[in-house]
Interface confidence: medium
């Protein structure tokens, strides 16, 4: 037995263009909640298939109202963990679906309205008792950051939570036939004492005092053979004395649990309680060892010679996780300097440098002006990874090779005519205007209209200018 725990860190717009609109508005304030669905194994399963390992809903998050015109920020999250208890062994390999739901709190007829904002899914390997694993998943323009782990509930221990441990009764060693519970060397495997009278041939127990039946047997002590032909009433209950099976398809009909597992019905499906050394939805999987190839992405498996001992995956560069299942996002450390573009090729990291920079991490600033001449007396100016020429009067272009036409920009105002000259340009002003660019009107009496009114005169009244 144990608990799968999920911690949501953030839910908000992902990187890149196309930021999503805020899911809430002043007219329709809303709050978020999350649903997690767990399934055993690594198979691609439809989103609608049952959450055979369990499911959980979070509490509702704080109410959020969009600020008009603001982009959608990371949205306020519910407090606490999402916890999915598992009663039996942890399967080691699992699939997950995490859904982000929006609860609209406007004046809804018949209560709040819910809508699915985003759904992410993945397949992972995870040993119980290990550290928190971090993950980032994207759904459209949204990004969800979360961590998860599986932990055993005492007295269960091990990577699958299948071994039961008790504190040592004697300081030196464990009882006869009982091993220490590595890594908890101060504890020993607990002797299992089943319910008194539990059939040794057809029953077994995983917890002291219980009696679970093997396939084909029933009754409180697993002494009654199951018979499907002795049902008298089509709607009668299951009988321990006759061994009659409940009619109508039920989750435990036919006992879907292999390897001596016992079946019990749950709200959405069934649960198999597996004997020691087996796990999975139907107790069909024995303990993972290196022979099962648990390490992904070329990881090297060490240890795990027997089902009760752990294995360790030594991951190649670029991968991490207890099963090397997670690619390390090495670009998130921003190793490329001077605005270089980071490319994680898996086997190596590459930086694509901006012009004017070089080196494995774009750390070298090239001498932009080295070997570059500016013609016609221009001088080279370095900057921003590209060279630029500051040209002498009368020349232009990237390398000052083009003869500039100073009159091209029509610099003379008020109809003045422009003449190119070796020292620049000259404006011949139209009547009534003066100045280097013909920018000042000339008053009829010959005084120039200055750009500011003299003291004592109101600006904006040209008739009063002297």
């Amino acid at each position: 037995a144990g608990v799968f725990e999920l911690q949501i860190h953030s839910f908000g717009p992902g990187p890149g263009p196309g930021a999503p609109r805020s899911p809430c508005s002043a007219r329709l304030p809303c709050r978020l909640f999350f649903r997690v669905c767990l399934k055993p194994g690594l198979s691609e399963e439809a989103a609608e298939s049952p959450c055979a390992l369990g499911a959980a809903l979070s509490a509702r998050g704080p109410v959020y109202t969009e600020q008009p015109g603001a982009p959608a920020p990371d949205l306020p999250l519910p407090d606490g963990l999402l916890q999915v208890p598992f009663r039996d062994a942890w399967p080691g390999t699992f699939s997950f679906i995490i859904e982000t739901w929006r609860e609209e709190l406007g004046d809804q007829i018949g209560g709040p309205a819910w809508s699915l904002l985003a759904r992410v899914a993945g397949r992972r390997r995870l040993a119980a008792g290990g550290p928190w694993a971090r993950d980032i998943q994207r759904a459209g323009a949204w990004e969800l950051r979360f961590s998860y782990r599986a932990r055993c509930e005492p007295p269960a221990v091990g990577t699958a939570c299948t071994r039961l441990c008790r504190p040592r009764s004697a300081p030196s060693r464990c009882g006869p036939g009982l091993r220490p519970c590595a890594p908890l060397e101060d504890e020993c495997e607990a002797p299992l004492v089943c319910r008194a009278g539990c059939s040794p041939e057809h029953g077994f127990c995983e917890q002291p005092g219980e009696c679970r039946c093997l396939e084909g047997w029933t009754g409180p002590l697993c002494t009654v053979p199951v018979s499907t032909s002795s049902c008298l009433s089509p709607r009668g209950p299951s009988s321990a004395t006759t061994g009659c099976l409940v009619p109508g398809p039920g989750p435990c009909d036919g006992n879907p649990c292999a390897n001596g597992g016992s079946c019990s019905e749950t709200p959405r499906s069934f649960e198999c309680t597996c004997p020691r050394g087996f796990y999975g939805l139907r107790c069909e999987v024995s303990g993972v060892t290196c022979a099962d190839g648990p390490c992904f992405n070329g990881g090297l498996c060490v240890g795990g010679a027997d089902p009760d001992s752990a294995y360790i995956c030594h991951c190649p560069p670029g991968f991490q996780g207890s099963n090397c299942e997670k690619r390390v996002d090495r670009c998130s450390l921003q190793p490329c300097r001077n605005g270089g573009l980071c490319l994680d090729l898996g086997h190596a990291l590459r930086c694509r440098c901006r012009a004017g920079f070089a080196g494995p991490r774009c750390e070298h600033d090239l001498d932009d002006c080295a070997g570059r001449a500016c013609a016609n007396g221009g001088t080279c100016v370095e900057g921003g990874g590209a060279h630029r020429c500051s040209c002498a009067l009368g020349f232009g272009g990237r390398d000052c090779r083009e003869r500039a036409d100073p009159c091209a920009a029509r610099p003379c105002a008020h109809g003045g005519r422009c003449y190119a000259h070796f020292s620049g340009l000259v404006c011949a002003c139209a009547p009534g205007y003066m100045g280097a660019r013909c920018e000042f009107p000339v008053h009829p009496d010959g005084a120039s209209a200055l750009p500011a009114a003299p003291p004592g005169l109101r600006p904006g009244d040209p008739q009063r200018y002297l």
């Epitope: 709607r235 009619p247 109508g248 989750p251 009909d253 879907p256 709200p267 959405r268 139907r282």
Partner: nanobody
Framework: EVQLVESGGGLVQPGGSLRLSCAAS????????IGWVRHAPGKGEELVAR????????RYADSVKGRFTISADTSKNTAYLQMNSLRAEDTAVYYC???????????????????SGQGTLVTVSS
């Protein structure tokens, strides 16, 4: 397209009654087990009741036995949950759910909830 649409929820006083309906489309309820699952704030899901319309077999959670009755009308492809003697702890969102049942590896069966509706809110309060 498989669809389950619940109706009949609402506000009722303790001791009162409500009848929830679940209209199914896109499949024949006779071929499946139909259940009502409820989810209350801060609690896990609970399978309240389940019916196999083909032979009328029903199953109830201990917490509702004697108070709730599940039924089905195969001609209308609809399931019902009659809820009497309602208590405050019955307050929850009630989902109608289809449970599928298919052969697995030659001898046993795979069973589980594969579709559910959007839910209807039942509030028991004075």
């Amino acid at each position: 397209e498989v669809q389950l649409v619940e109706s009949g929820g609402g506000l009722v006083q303790p001791g009162g009654s409500l009848r929830l309906s679940c209209a199914a489309s896109g499949f024949n309820i006779s071929h499946y087990s139909i259940g009502w699952v409820r989810h209350a704030p801060g609690k896990g899901e609970e399978l309240v009741a389940r019916i196999y319309p083909t032979n009328g077999y029903t199953r109830y959670a201990d917490s509702v036995k004697g108070r709730f009755t599940i039924s089905a009308d195969t001609s209308k492809n609809t399931a019902y949950l009659q809820m009497n003697s309602l208590r405050a702890e019955d307050t929850a969102v009630y989902y109608c759910a289809r449970h599928h049942y298919s052969h697995y590896d030659g001898h046993s069966h795979y069973y589980g909830l594969d579709y559910s509706g959007q839910g209807t809110l039942v509030t028991v309060s004075s």
